[in-house]
């Protein structure tokens, strides 16, 4: 293994070297959602395609029951886009009861669940007021950032209203993560 | 430095180690677009600056004729932002004929062309209805995600209407990819 | 043309190997902003949380006085999201004097400051016209891309109007960078 020593003396290496192709990675794509129960005060979670088309999981990054399972501690870049679409001829039509003067909105949250911590942690949130004049509207919310995760953490994507999610194409709504 | 060899036997390395600085990478920036032919049913492709200002290509990642050329198989993070701007005093003014009740829209697609598949593959799409009341409007669409690409694949960015793309500044409209 | 076949990727290693866990990285999160002086013709810079909650800096990447300090030359992925919110019942209410027919807007700029260069460099800009009919509006602008940075460079996030930035939650407004 001598030839693979990284030896230049100025180089401080504090962690073992590892092959990039061996890092946990996943890109999940949208599927048609089935209405599911969700906790009060918590937005419903999307479920995902993990192996067909553009979707994949690799190197011990697994997907199960709406969650990406983190197999190894480290810093991960996590991203998601959700495309929403709705039909409304004026703002007031999709206004929820009891919300006078508060605009309608669409929200995406990437959430971390840790067994050792009772409350889910919101890592990323994209939220947008919607007050479209046209009869049909559609728009994406994109999120992405780096987080330090622990082995065993679980990631999910929550949305304010599952019925507004565009599930028609794998390139419009997606969710991914990779170890840096 | 012998002890710093990456040899610990518990470490499964399934791929050859390689220096990060040697990985294919590119960040391309907007230039003024010239109208070009494009396939029926396919949005026109943008062309890009690849060496001036903030733009660069490195480590065998090349740009030619609207395409980023993938020199090595692997997992890439691909991203683009396109800033659109238009002028309209009401929604109906930029409405295309024959599209009653369908909102005007702006769309960005990152497309992969591969020799092993006759159809270009849409990797990422950002699409947004536009129904602006103001006389001038502008807004960005951002996309980014990870994909498994093959040596020889080509990437391009397609837009719904080239004439609406803001080509004035390199920080407003851009396209990039890097091997993870 | 034999030479134009792409060479096996595992062979040419032009840079020393280094452990991924040792790379400079930071994720900063929003704090309540205090009004600060800023240069004429330059948007004000946000300041950030760098160690509490989801925020961190590591491996010689430091945060000081609104700036992320780049400790090592290389290619970095840089990202930010700023969530804006405002109150207006019609477009004209937040219109600045002397800007007839020009839409109100929100803008985020990620800026690089280099000691050896007199002018800051705008790396990324997200700018959006705002003409909301509803009485309260809110929306994010997300940016992210890869840039070649030099040791000693400083990064900051500038916004068009600090008073419109949503500083209430660390997942809504953030700024990060990591060495690739």
């Amino acid at each position: 293994l001598k030839g693979q020593e990284f030896a230049p003396s100025h180089q401080q290496v504090y962690a073992p070297l590892r092959a990039d192709g061996d890092k946990p990675r996943a890109h999940l794509t949208v599927v048609r959602q089935t209405p599911t129960q969700h906790f009060k005060n918590q937005f419903p979670a999307l479920h995902w395609e993990h192996e067909l088309g553009l979707a994949f999981t690799k190197n011990r990054m697994n997907y199960t029951n709406k969650f990406l399972l983190i197999p190894e501690s480290g810093d991960y870049f996590i991203y998601s886009q959700v495309t929403f679409r709705g039909m409304t001829s004026e703002c007031s039509e999709i206004r929820q009861a009891g919300r006078p003067n508060k605009p309608d909105s669409i929200t995406v949250v990437i959430t971390k669940v840790t067994d050792s911590y009772p409350e889910p942690t919101q890592l990323l949130m994209g939220t947008k007021s919607v007050c479209e004049v046209g009869s049909n509207w559609f728009q994406p919310i994109y999120l992405g950032a780096m987080f330090s995760l622990q082995e065993g953490d679980k990631l999910m994507v929550n949305v304010s209203d599952i019925s507004l999610v565009d599930y028609t194409k794998e390139d419009k709504t997606f969710f991914g993560a990779f170890l840096l | 430095l012998k002890g710093q060899e990456f040899a610990p036997s518990h470490q499964q390395v399934y791929a050859p180690l390689r220096a990060d600085g040697d990985k294919p990478r590119a960040h391309l920036t907007v230039v003024r677009q010239t109208p070009t032919q494009h396939f029926k049913n396919q949005f026109p492709a943008l062309h890009w600056e690849h060496e001036l200002g903030l733009a660069f290509t490195k480590n065998r990642m090349n740009y030619t004729n609207k395409f980023l050329l993938i020199p090595e198989s692997g997992d890439y993070f691909i991203y683009s932002q396109v800033t659109f701007r238009g002028m309209t005093s009401e929604c109906s003014e930029i409405r295309q004929a024959g599209r009653p009740n369908k909102p005007d829209s702006i769309t960005v697609v990152i497309t992969k062309v591969t020799d092993s598949y006759p159809e270009p593959t849409q990797l990422l799409m950002g699409t947004k209805s536009v129904c602006e009341v103001g006389s001038n409007w502008f807004q960005p669409i951002y996309l980014g995600a990870m994909f498994s690409l093959q040596e020889g694949d080509k990437l391009m960015v397609n837009v719904s209407d080239i004439s609406l793309v803001d080509y004035t500044k390199e920080d407003k409209t851009f396209f990039g990819a890097f091997l993870l | 043309l034999k030479g134009q076949e792409f060479a096996p990727s595992h062979q040419q290693v032009y840079a020393p190997l280094r452990a991924d866990g040792d790379k400079p990285r930071a994720h900063l999160t929003v704090v309540r902003q205090t009004p600060t002086q800023h240069f004429k013709n330059q948007f004000p810079a946000l300041h950030w949380e760098h160690e509490l909650g989801l925020a961190f800096t590591k491996n010689r990447m430091n945060y000081t006085n609104k700036f992320l300090l780049i400790p090592e030359s290389g290619d970095y992925f840089i990202y930010s999201q700023v969530t804006f919110r405002g109150m207006t019942s019609e477009c004209s209410e937040i219109r600045q004097a002397g800007r007839p027919n020009k839409p109100d807007s929100i803008t985020v700029v990620i800026t690089k400051v280099t000691d050896s260069y007199p002018e800051p460099t705008q790396l990324l800009m997200g700018t959006k016209s705002v003409c909301e009919v509803g009485s309260n509006w809110f929306q994010p602008i997300y940016l992210g891309a890869m840039f070649s940075l030099q040791e000693g460079d400083k990064l900051m996030v500038n916004v068009s109007d600090i008073s419109l930035v949503d500083y209430t939650k660390e997942d809504k407004t953030f700024f990060g960078a990591f060495l690739l």
Epitope: - | Q37, N65, V113, D115, Y117, P120 | -
Partner: antibody, heavy 116, light 106 residues
Framework: QVQLQESGPGLVRPSQTLSLTCTVS????????IHWVRQRPGRGLEWMGR????????KYNPSLKSRVTITRDTSKNQVSLRLSSVTAADTAVYYC?????????WGQGSLVTVSS | DIQMTQSPSSLSASVGDRVTITCRAS?????MYWYQQKPGKAPKDLIY???NLASGVPSRFSGSGSGTDFTFTISSLQPEDIATYYC?????????FGQGTKVEIK
């Protein structure tokens, strides 16, 4: 409309080099990939290789790699095939074909006979 | 190399019959492609990426399968379908074709 047209000599002497040109029209050559496929008399189809005209990047059938060269001239909308050291076993109809567009297209084929 | 084994090598069926051709790859592939070649003509795309109908191809043609086993079907054979049909995989190098199935009318 999309067209691919093979051209070249119909007769090549043994041990010489076979040269064919594929001229395309109706699409941007650099947007796609061009393949060469041959069909020997009474036999099936054999993929010879392909070029990405945008980059010049080529892939060849390993069984032919030592003898085949594919190049492109985007200014003329042409892709060329050269097969060296031919024998009678190289007698075939040679097709150029496109992939990477909305549909694949094939040329009509060019019969090349190797004979002295 | 990925070898493609196509069967049968020839078949004879009546107009209106359902015709099935199979193709087996020596290694798993993501997609299979099917072509039709009439005597003296260039091959024509029929099915791409296993199950997608190429532009202008009648709906009586279909494809299915995954991994190593793929199937091409003509749901109701027509006189104009007399031709040789080839499968092809595009993933390994070389891009290999099956040896062809010649379809005739009884």
């Amino acid at each position: 409309q999309v067209q691919l047209q093979e051209s070249g000599p119909g007769l090549v002497r043994p041990s010489q080099t076979l040269s064919l040109t594929c001229t395309v029209s109706g699409f941007d050559l650099q947007d796609t990939y061009i393949h060469w496929v041959r069909q020997r008399p009474g036999r099936g189809l054999e993929w010879m290789g392909r070029i990405d005209p945008a980059s010049g990047h080529v892939k060849y059938n390993p069984s032919l790699k030592s003898r085949v060269t594919i190049t492109r001239d985007t200014s003329k909308n042409q892709v060329s095939l050269r097969l060296s050291s031919v024998t009678a076993a190289d007698t075939a109809v040679y097709y150029c074909a496109r992939s990477g567009g909305m549909t694949d297209y094939w040329g009509q084929g060019s019969l090349v006979t190797v004979s002295s | 190399d990925i070898q493609m084994t196509q069967s049968p090598s020839s078949l004879s069926a009546s107009v209106g019959d359902r015709v099935t051709i199979t193709c087996r790859a020596s290694f798993s592939v993501d997609y299979m492609y099917w072509y039709q070649q009439k005597p003296g003509k260039a091959p024509k795309d029929l099915i791409y990426a296993t199950s997608n109908l190429a532009s202008g191809v009648p709906s009586r043609f279909s494809g299915s399968g995954s991994g190593t086993d793929f199937t091409f079907t003509i749901s109701s054979l027509q006189p104009e379908d007399i031709a040789t049909y080839y499968c092809q995989q595009w993933e390994g190098n070389p891009r290999s074709f099956g040896q062809g199935t010649k379809v005739e009318i009884k």
